[in-house]
């Protein structure tokens, strides 16, 4: 790991050991300044492995709303607009960090949680397994 | 929004207004119990819109390492294994939350930050724009 020199102006922390509790400012800083969300917003429809987006809501989690991708077809869309089953639509998954209220229903106390979300779908060549 | 009944056993919070500072336990709880990471690990190579993964490291961020996808080609791979430029490989992007050390170099004080990451690539039909 990388050793970070401690800033003398840091807030005091009661517990220096893991598992450790830290202070987090929930006033989100958005780094996505140069992005054009319009450009990628319709990929789910234009893809050869199109997907639908499902809303997952959990008030005990921050962020409370997460969108999950579900591939529309087992196969992929070919040049004629038909589903080609020689190829497969598969979800691209990513592990993300969320905050889970702990103890439950507490507005100011959380625990970091790692969850796996499907972000979209891609078209892959299936691996052929010869079985007995 | 959904109103959450407050648990009487919650820790006290000095500031009830936004921007608010909350307590976060960094002992990560992993919800990804039923997943098989091996299955999706090679999609980046088998996809018709393959991608490379680039390591982005920042010690002032938590998690400090994030992997960014970059599509290998402008076009997509066809059935013959050649790049077909009638279609386009595009990145699937997702906004994720990370923790940024604030003030800098402080081990126990963070601010939530939203960043856009490319998770993988998908193959789309390009939109044709007629220009002067």
């Amino acid at each position: 790991g990388i050793t970070i020199p401690r800033n003398p102006g840091c807030p005091n922390s009661e517990d220096k050991n893991f598992p450790r509790t830290v202070m987090v400012n929930l006033n989100i800083h958005n780094r996505n300044t140069n992005t054009n969300p319009k450009r990628s917003s319709d990929y789910y429809n234009r893809s050869t492995s199109p997907w639908n987006l499902h809303r997952n809501e959990d008030p005990e989690r921050y962020p409370s709303v997460i969108w999950e991708a579900k591939c529309r077809h087992l196969g992929c869309i070919n040049a004629d607009g038909n589903v080609d089953y020689h190829m497969n639509s598969v979800p691209i998954q990513q592990e993300i960090l969320v905050l889970r209220r702990e103890p439950p229903h507490c507005p100011n106390s959380f625990r970091l949680e790692k969850i796996l979300v499907s972000v979209g779908c891609t078209c892959v060549t299936p691996i052929v397994h010869h079985v007995a | 929004g959904i109103t959450i009944p407050r648990n009487p056993g919650c820790p006290n919070s000095e500031d009830k207004n936004f921007p608010r500072t909350v307590m976060v336990n960094l002992n990560i709880h992993n919800r990804n119990t039923n997943t098989n990471p091996k299955r999706s690990s090679d999609y980046y190579n088998r996809s018709t819109s393959p991608w490379n993964l680039h390591r982005n490291e920042d010690p002032e961020r938590y998690p400090s390492v994030i992997w960014e996808a970059k599509c290998r080609h402008l076009g997509c791979i066809n059935a013959d294994g050649n790049v077909d430029y009638h279609m386009n490989s595009v990145p699937i992007q997702q906004e994720i939350l990370v923790l940024r050390r604030e003030p800098p170099h402080c081990p126990n004080s963070f601010r939530l930050e939203k960043i856009l990451v490319s998770v993988g690539c998908t193959c789309v039909t390009p939109i044709v724009h007629h220009v002067a």
Epitope: S40 | C71, N88, V90, P126, V128, H129
Partner: nanobody
Amino acid sequence: QVQLVESGGGLVRTGGSLRLSCSVSGDISSQSAMGWYRQVPGRQRELVAMIHTTKGDTYYADSVKGRFTISRINANNTIYLQMNNLKPEDTAIYYCTHNEPGDLYMGQGTQVTVSS
């Protein structure tokens, strides 16, 4: 806003040569390409040749390989399509294109007619 300016079409005899040129201005990313499509009325648009903006990789349709050459001058984002040994079946409207991932920008087109 992407803008494309084409020039160089015309009438030529079978076996003759023509050179098309096109300059692009506007937002150009590192993962983009410039090229030429052609269209004969009533037929599907065909990708003729393409060159990658940064890598310089080129692509040619099988029907033009060995006869057409695409090249690019990076300084002013201009591409050229040198067309040699032209055939009557090369007659079409040629459109300059700029391809950003997910978006294909097409110019107004220039007519190329090859007479026998």
